[in-house]
């Protein structure tokens, strides 16, 4: 539902690379939308060499994208699905995930989300936009702005907690994941550490806290002693294959 915030999210998964494409290099000028620097999506949509990114569900795409068949706006029935650019305000939609951050799908149209639509504690549009890539994007119209982020901080591999654009910016054993205020380098999860499986298919929360993926030889699985727990509270941890 709209009233759920995806907080604990293994949004950064071991996904295949974009079809025929590679990510940009640290230190390069990259066109990005504020608040939408995510791994595993079509990261650099504004670049000429953009390649589609295959997906099975919305959560495998960046927060400025949704998963769908390229030939139709809704989720396709069968066939290859890819991450498509989110729909801006006043554009047609069929579910919340289709609308860009700060908007939600109402009566088939992407509408701006104000505080009455979100519970207390959910991150607001202005913060998700402002904190994403450190550009003042609090535009009067509320649209996520495309801006160019050219930063000298990516020349050396980021240590734990330092800001990043993508996992290649981080030192070994770290991945790039959102941590409330920014995207930072976080440790890849070890055996026994809590991870999160995406279960939601149609809902789309604002991902304000992401965990890294499980380390090599580990998989995110339900903890054995939590099998009896209710679906909503089942705990997943990184476990040996």
């Amino acid at each position: 539902t709209l009233n759920s915030v995806l907080i604990n999210s293994n949004a950064i998964k071991n996904l295949p690379p974009p079809l025929g494409g590679a990510g940009g290099q640290p230190g390069s000028a990259v066109s990005v939308a504020p608040g939408v620097l995510y791994e595993g999506g079509n990261k650099y949509q504004t670049l000429d060499n953009y390649q589609p990114y295959p997906c099975a569900e919305d959560e495998e795409c960046g927060s400025d994208e949704y998963c769908s068949s390229p030939s139709r706006g809704a989720a396709g029935v069968g066939g290859v699905q890819i991450c498509l650019a989110c729909r801006k305000r006043r554009k047609r939609c069929m579910r919340h995930a289709m609308c860009c951050p700060g908007n939600y799908c109402k009566n088939g149209i992407c509408m701006p989300s104000d505080h009455s639509h979100f519970p207390r504690g959910e991150i607001e549009e202005s913060i998700i936009e402002n904190l994403g890539n450190d550009h003042n994007a609090a535009a009067g119209d509320g649209y996520p702005r495309r801006t160019t982020l050219t930063s000298k901080i990516y020349h050396t591999k980021g240590q734990e907690g330092s800001v990043c654009l993508r996992s290649s910016d981080c030192a070994a054993g770290l991945c790039c994941a959102r941590h409330f205020w920014s995207k930072i380098c976080k440790p890849v999860l070890k055996e026994g550490q809590v991870c999160t499986k995406h279960k939601r298919k149609g809902s789309h929360g604002l991902e304000i806290f992401q965990r890294c993926y499980c380390g090599e030889g580990l998989a995110c699985r339900i903890q054995k002693d939590h099998h009896q727990a209710s679906n909503s509270s089942r705990l997943h941890t990184c476990q040996r294959h």
Epitope: E160, H179, W181, I184, Q193
Partner: antibody, heavy 116, light 111 residues
């Protein structure tokens, strides 16, 4: 190793101003968000303000909004907190802290006393 | 405003295990699943002990562990030692307030 050293605290009259500094070393200062957190005598911790790595985004607790200004000088590896219109309830030890994975490194703090 | 409730004080003998609770609401602790714990010795700066509910930063003893059930997060210290005597603060995150701290718990190691 990571080091944060605050300075600039002292005794000031209500309505007065003070500027705190935090000198950072042992890490790439310009790659981290930074925060100020305060602790009134015998009380708990209260987050005061945060600033993004380049300084273009700043955020404040309601209790200090409009009176305090956070800033940074990445060329000097220094974080600042300009405090204006000080009140008795602003009396506290002020810590600067690195916003890594949460507040992962803290300075030793500087005491600000607001009293007439 | 978000408020995190901690017991004012907890005590235990060396070698024992103690647990400090931190109770919030479904809007913060319960909904976010994200709680951190800090240790503060008298006259010293706070130190991050647990993040993301149960993860220890490097250098923190494995005697410290965190967990969460419903709207309550817990910090457990096993094999209590004299140097564990300190104030402990839980912290969660709020989109308006950034860092929200509990009122703190004074841990006394007896004997």
């Amino acid at each position: 190793q990571v080091q944060l050293v605050e300075s600039g605290g002292g005794l000031v009259q209500p309505g007065g101003s003070l500027r705190l500094s935090c000198a950072a070393s042992g890490f790439t200062f310009s790659s981290y968000w930074m925060s100020w957190v305060r602790q009134a005598p015998g009380k708990g911790l209260e987050w005061v303000s945060g600033i993004s790595y380049s300084g273009s985004n700043t955020h404040y607790a309601d209790s200090v909004k409009g009176r305090f200004t956070i800033s940074r000088d990445n060329s000097k590896n220094t974080l600042y907190l300009q405090m204006n219109s000080l009140r008795a309830e602003d009396t506290a030890v002020y810590y600067c802290a690195r916003m890594g994975i949460d507040l992962d490194y803290w300075g030793q703090g500087t005491l600000v006393t607001v009293s007439s | 405003d978000i408020a995190l409730t901690q017991p004012a004080s907890v005590s235990g003998s060396p070698g024992q295990s103690i647990t400090i609770s931190c109770t919030g609401t479904s809007s913060d602790v319960g909904g976010f699943n994200y709680v951190s714990w800090y240790q503060q010795h008298p006259g010293k700066a706070p130190k991050l002990m647990i993040h993301d509910g149960s993860n220890r930063p490097s250098g923190v003893s494995n005697r410290f562990s965190g967990s969460k059930s419903g709207n309550t997060a817990s910090l457990t210290i096993s094999g209590l030692q004299a140097e564990d005597e300190a104030d402990y603060y839980c912290q969660t995150w709020d989109s308006l307030s950034f860092f929200v701290f509990g009122g703190g718990t004074k841990l006394t190691v007896l004997g």
